[in-house]
Amino acid sequence: MKGTKDLTSQQKESNVKTFCSKNILAILGFSSIIAVIALLAVGLTQNKALPENIKYGIVLDAGSSHTSLYIYKWPAEKENDTGVVHQVEECRVKGPGISKYVQKVNEIGIYLTDCMERAREVIPRSQHQETPVYLGATAGMRLLRMESEELADRVLDVVERSLSNYPFDFQGARIITGQEEGAYGWITINYLLGKFSQKTRWFSIVPYETNNQETFGALDLGGASTQITFVPQNQTTESPDNALQFRLYGKDYNVYTHSFLCYGKDQALWQKLAKDIQVASNEILRDPCFHPGYKKVVNVSDLYKTPCTKRFEMTLPFQQFEIQGIGNYQQCHQSVLELFNTSYCPYSQCAFNGIFLPPLQGDFGAFSAFYFVMNFLNLTSEKVSQEKVTEMMKKFCSQPWEEIKTSYAGVKEKYLSEYCFSGTYILSLLLQGYHFTADSWEHIHFIGKIQGSDAGWTLGYMLNLTNMIPAEQPLSTPLSHSTYVFLMVLFSLVLVIVAIIGLLIFHKPSYFWKDMV
């Protein structure tokens, strides 16, 4: 009986073994097929049309103080994707802004030569003819046009003729509006931060990138104007002039923007000097915005050479005056505040000069001169509070000029002398002009570059003009690098696990089954 009993249990065991092995085989087979298909699908989707057809684009930013040339590069077959365009080169043109060439337009061609030749070197010759070139002029040229449309037009005409001589696909030179400058700056930083992407990200490669798709506001400071652009909480605007509507990648954005002409750092300084010299008792201007011991002679004719100082213009009993620095942050701050008229506001809330400003919302990227100045002062860290920034500015401005010159021997004196004013101006503009507070200060991120591309309006301008920002989300969005890596690793692991289990099943003795049953 015992033998019969043993035989029956052996049969049962054999049946169970067969049953289990069949099921496990089926499961393993199915899993491995799925994993292989998934790996192939992910691999093929990600690496479709592999021969990399690279495209290039050139944008010249003709600012008030200088001109910069930017070269961008992107894979042709991915040009509607988010974040695929990146900057490969920046070339700073030697000399002032193009508006300064109004009396010597014949020199513009030579002025642009070096950077255009650099573009010729960087971009492969085979790509030259299909590389678009755009020149956008900003507030310096807006100011010149206020004086004379013909003068501004003449400068642009010579610029166009010069740029047409190169082998690229020249697309024109124009003065962009303040609204465009603000909007394109906003597009640039949000494009680079991946805010227009609808993909879920497992990890972030961009330091300021958050997992949510809330866009960043843009704060841009130039030499002659400053722009503020963001998506406010309340979508209804009191001032249609400041409202923009975009549809980008299938999502609607209602954006507030304003450009304050004459409130760039250079023109703000001219305004301040013109205002302060009105009350000077003689040809000496004791200025708290310059370091103690600093001296500089200014021609009155230069002071009034800009439409920005018109409101302070008066006849002075001297042709020149001398700035004598006294280095006092608090007094400098008070002097700067007088440039902002906050007594008049026809809206529920204003920035200054009667310009509507909705309540601030979200994080802001502060770039261009906001970044350059704060970076020089070593105040761009996220950890530095507004109180600390003010404290550092007080300390910096009070340092004697001779000491400053020694500490920063490599910096041009013209620029070095103005950091006290510029830093103070930035604080005043952000706090009193735009109503940031000590608490909301932490929402300001001083940004120079994002993933190697300069923050500024030029990239957004090119993306728009080359139709690389679709209104609708592209149908088949290729995976982000992080998603691709994650899926490849996941399905590879599935295959490895399947293989290990398979090996264990078919190379283990029968007691393995006893343990399992």
């Epitope: 010149l144 004379s148 501004a152 050479k305 800009t306 439409p307 018109k310």
Partner: antibody, heavy 123, light 106 residues
């Protein structure tokens, strides 16, 4: 209303100097570019010199370059033309003229003119 | 410099008729062309600015057209007060005037 009144004309010997003035009223003087245009007896109009609103651009006709100087005093709402090394061919009625505007932008055309002041260069 | 050539030098027209005055620039001046009227013993008066814009206070019978190098001033129905000398002026380069067209009573 806009008014431009020239003064300072007269008879002067060749090689000598003369200063013309143009008193402006009825508009914000420092917001506009100003010009001198002349007209020789029985002849057409000839532009002489321009001074843009913010002194960004000061320009002269080749015929007067190096001899004439345009200037302005915004506190006095006055435009000047300092003429030196005068020649017989400088004899003309000298008009003061204001730059026009294209909307918010300045324009190099002349929307208001004074009645002119006669300058005669003769020995 | 940009040379402006006006034609004809003299134009004889009867009141109520249409008058067409031409101005040619030696090089392209975009639309920076302006027209003035001058009567004997008076200062010039702006009629048209930037090729086709009517200056304030100027009757609608005056109109301007053209761009580049060829420009036209048209007076649709001549009135007695329209008989005068007409000048064109370009402002693309430093200002230059045409030699004038004398519009006289036929």
């Amino acid at each position: 209303q806009v008014q431009l009144v020239e003064s300072g004309g007269g008879v002067v010997q060749p090689g000598r100097s003369l200063r013309l003035s143009c008193a402006a009223s009825g508009f914000t003087f420092n917001n506009y570019g100003m010009n001198w245009v002349r007209q020789a007896p029985g002849k057409g109009l000839e532009w002489v010199a321009s001074f843009s609103s913010s002194s960004t651009y000061i320009s002269y006709a080749d015929t007067v370059k190096g001899r004439f100087t345009i200037s302005r005093d915004n506190s006095k709402n006055t435009l000047y033309l300092q003429m030196s090394s005068l020649r017989a061919e400088d004899t003309a009625v000298y008009y003061c003229a204001r730059h026009g505007r294209y909307g918010g932008y300045g324009g190099f055309y002349f929307d208001y003119w004074g009645q002119g002041t006669m300058v005669t260069v003769s020995s | 410099e940009t040379v402006m050539t006006q034609s004809p030098a003299t134009l004889s027209v009867s009141p109520g008729e249409r008058a067409t005055l031409s101005c040619r620039a030696s090089e392209g001046v975009k639309s920076y062309m302006h027209w003035y009227q001058q009567k004997p013993g008076q200062a010039p008066r702006l009629l048209i600015y930037k090729a086709s814009n009517l200056a304030s206070g100027i009757p609608a019978r005056f109109s301007g057209s053209g761009s580049g190098t060829e420009f036209t001033l048209t007076i649709s129905s001549l009135q007695s007060e329209d008989f005068a000398v007409y000048y064109c002026q370009q402002s693309w380069n430093d200002p230059t005037f045409g030699q004038g067209t004398k519009l006289e009573l036929k």
